[in-house]
């Protein structure tokens, strides 16, 4: 989905390369073609990252942290390519890299600044704690510290609790919001400014539905066009809240177009799914079907949560029997 890395050109032979944690990147360096090519990559002017001369690598004094993680584009060296292929970058790899390239004609040095970002896909969760309802936007691993903003009915809200845990190389962040008794829609945005990546979570509460036992109910779930891109992989999950925890009724994976149904009374309309409408039907309702139903549409860039409250009441017949 994402490029190997992206370069920002800045003056004075210095480039900024932005990479993602645990992914491979390229530190770019080019030179004027010439014979007797010598390439030395160093980190912070001290640690030997990679050395090449006399037609082969010389890694005897390579710093151990770079072992088996670096290589050059050997077939392109004679064309003036001294770029370094760097495997599995970590946050400890951030810093300034100097590429020294010498030939029989000239010697040049290029500086490359490596910045590493982390953005494991965030999640928006809906939780009940005793009598309170919470929305929680969380990201398990992110670096640098992200910007988290909340909106209620499209209006920014200042209340923004952040529970932050720092590990060796990234942050884990939870941002809970108490939405008890609210019928508003909520939106949470998490932005990683370094990776220029934004994720949005949106929560919508639908009007409560009152149904009689044995009837069926249709619950709507249609993505908001602002976020939804059918070309991007996403997952749709329908769940039911029972005694404080959600149990999955069914889910749909866009990549395989697979639908998995765990509740025999649940039905999905294939034609509607093809039109990106994930509304569902639940047949033959019984009293224990009362509760909250959650539709979760999630991709790498968004989570859309839609909540329906269903009240199933005894039918007249059942009532008269009792």
């Amino acid at each position: 989905i994402f490029p190997l890395a992206f370069f920002i050109y800045v003056p004075m032979n210095e480039q900024i390369v932005i990479g993602r944690l645990d992914e491979d990147i390229i530190l770019p360096s080019s030179f004027e073609r010439g014979s007797e090519v010598v390439i030395h990559w160093k980190y912070q002017d001290s640690y030997k990252v990679h050395s090449y001369y006399k037609g082969s690598d010389h890694l005897e004094s390579q710093d151990p942290r770079y072992a088996n993680r670096t290589s050059l584009f050997y077939n392109e060296i004679q064309n003036g390519n001294a770029s370094l292929f760097f495997r599995r970058v970590s946050l400890l790899d951030e810093g300034i890299y100097t590429c020294y390239v010498g030939t029989a004609i000239q010697v040049i040095t290029n500086k490359v600044v490596l910045k590493v970002g982390v953005f494991l896909t965030p999640v928006m969760k809906y939780e009940k704690r005793n009598t309170n309802s919470f929305l929680i936007c969380s990201v398990l691993s992110v670096y640098p510290r992200p910007i988290i903003t909340w909106k209620m009915d499209n209006t920014p809200i200042s209340e923004n609790n952040m529970e932050e845990t720092g590990s060796l190389d990234s942050f884990s962040i939870n941002s809970p919001l108490n939405i008890t008794g609210s019928n508003s829609s909520y939106e949470c945005t998490i932005e990683n400014s370094l990776l220029k990546q934004t994720w949005t979570g949106r929560w919508t509460m639908k009007d409560g539905l009152h149904k009689m036992q044995s009837e069926h109910v249709s619950l709507s779930c249609q993505p908001v066009n602002d976020y939804f891109s059918p070309n991007q992989d996403f997952k749709v999950t329908w769940s039911r809240m029972k005694s404080g925890t959600f149990s999955v009724l069914a889910y749909y994976l866009s990549s395989s177009q697979n639908t998995i149904i765990n509740e025999s009374r649940f039905s999905w309309n294939k034609e509607l799914i093809n039109q990106s409408d994930f509304s569902m039907n639940l047949m033959d309702l019984n009293l224990s079907d009362s509760g909250e139903y959650l539709c979760n549409i999630s991709s790498d860039e968004y989570t859309l949560l839609t909540i329906h409250t269903v009240h199933v009441e005894p039918s007249q017949e059942t009532a008269s029997h009792n």
Epitope: S35, E36, H40, K54, S61, Y100, G102
Partner: antibody
């Protein structure tokens, strides 16, 4: 143009020390490896030592290993050769020389040399 | 360490003669060999590197060949100004040993 000027030579007794300097100009000193090569008057060339462009790697001829130390100060564009425990057989003209590239190739420019005489 | 030998140690030839100097390494050094010329009372000057590549400004009558352990320096037509001592040097890895030199003069 490349200029290398050695200094610090002279007469010294066996067992004593001497430090040679080489002032470089006309090129980006910090980009190039540097060598010391010596020559007994009327005899052949003997390679003595090399230092890489940034000073990280050094190598020596067996005949001087443990007694001579090559170093450089890139901010002063100067190469040094610290010679300790001098012997009579160290008597020679000492040339400062520029490597083609980083310190792993041949010499493409030479200084005029400075004479070191070790004698009791 | 690899030893470098040169032959002959000295030679006399007439102006216009073709002169060949041999340099031998005790182990293979690929083509990492340079040739220098040192005229009497002067500092050495680079003639050839990578066994056969002529340094810029060096007359084309000088040429080099060889690879591995055996190398030659050839002066196709000896000139009076070529009177000098010629040294080979290996640079595949340190120590960057010189050969003992070949002294060339005019008959």
């Amino acid at each position: 143009q490349v200029q290398l000027v050695e200094s610090g030579g002279g007469v010294v007794q066996p067992g004593r020390s001497l430090r040679l300097s080489c002032a470089a100009s006309g090129f980006t000193f910090s980009n190039y490896g540097m060598h010391w090569v010596r020559q007994v008057p009327g005899k052949g060339l003997e390679w003595v030592a090399v230092i890489w462009y940034e000073g990280s790697e050094k190598d020596y001829a067996d005949s001087v290993k443990g007694r001579f130390t090559i170093s450089r100060d890139n901010s002063k564009n100067t190469l040094y050769l610290q010679m300790n425990s001098l012997r009579v057989e160290d008597t020679a003209v000492y040339y400062c020389a520029k490597d083609l590239i980083s310190g792993i190739y041949y010499v493409d420019h030479w200084g005029q040399g400075t004479l070191v005489t070790v004698s009791s | 360490d690899i030893q470098m030998t040169q032959s002959p140690s000295s030679l006399s030839a007439s102006v216009g003669d073709r002169v060949t100097i041999t340099c031998r390494a005790s182990q293979g050094i690929s083509n990492y060999l340079a040739w220098y010329q040192q005229k009497p009372g002067k500092v050495p000057k680079l003639l050839i590197y990578a066994a056969s590549t002529l340094q810029s400004g060096v007359p084309s009558r000088f040429s080099g060949s060889g690879s591995g352990t055996d190398f030659t320096l050839t002066i196709s037509s000896l000139q009076p100004e070529d009177v000098a001592t010629y040294y080979c040097q290996k640079y595949n890895s340190a120590p960057f040993t010189f050969g003992p030199g070949t002294k060339v003069d005019i008959k």
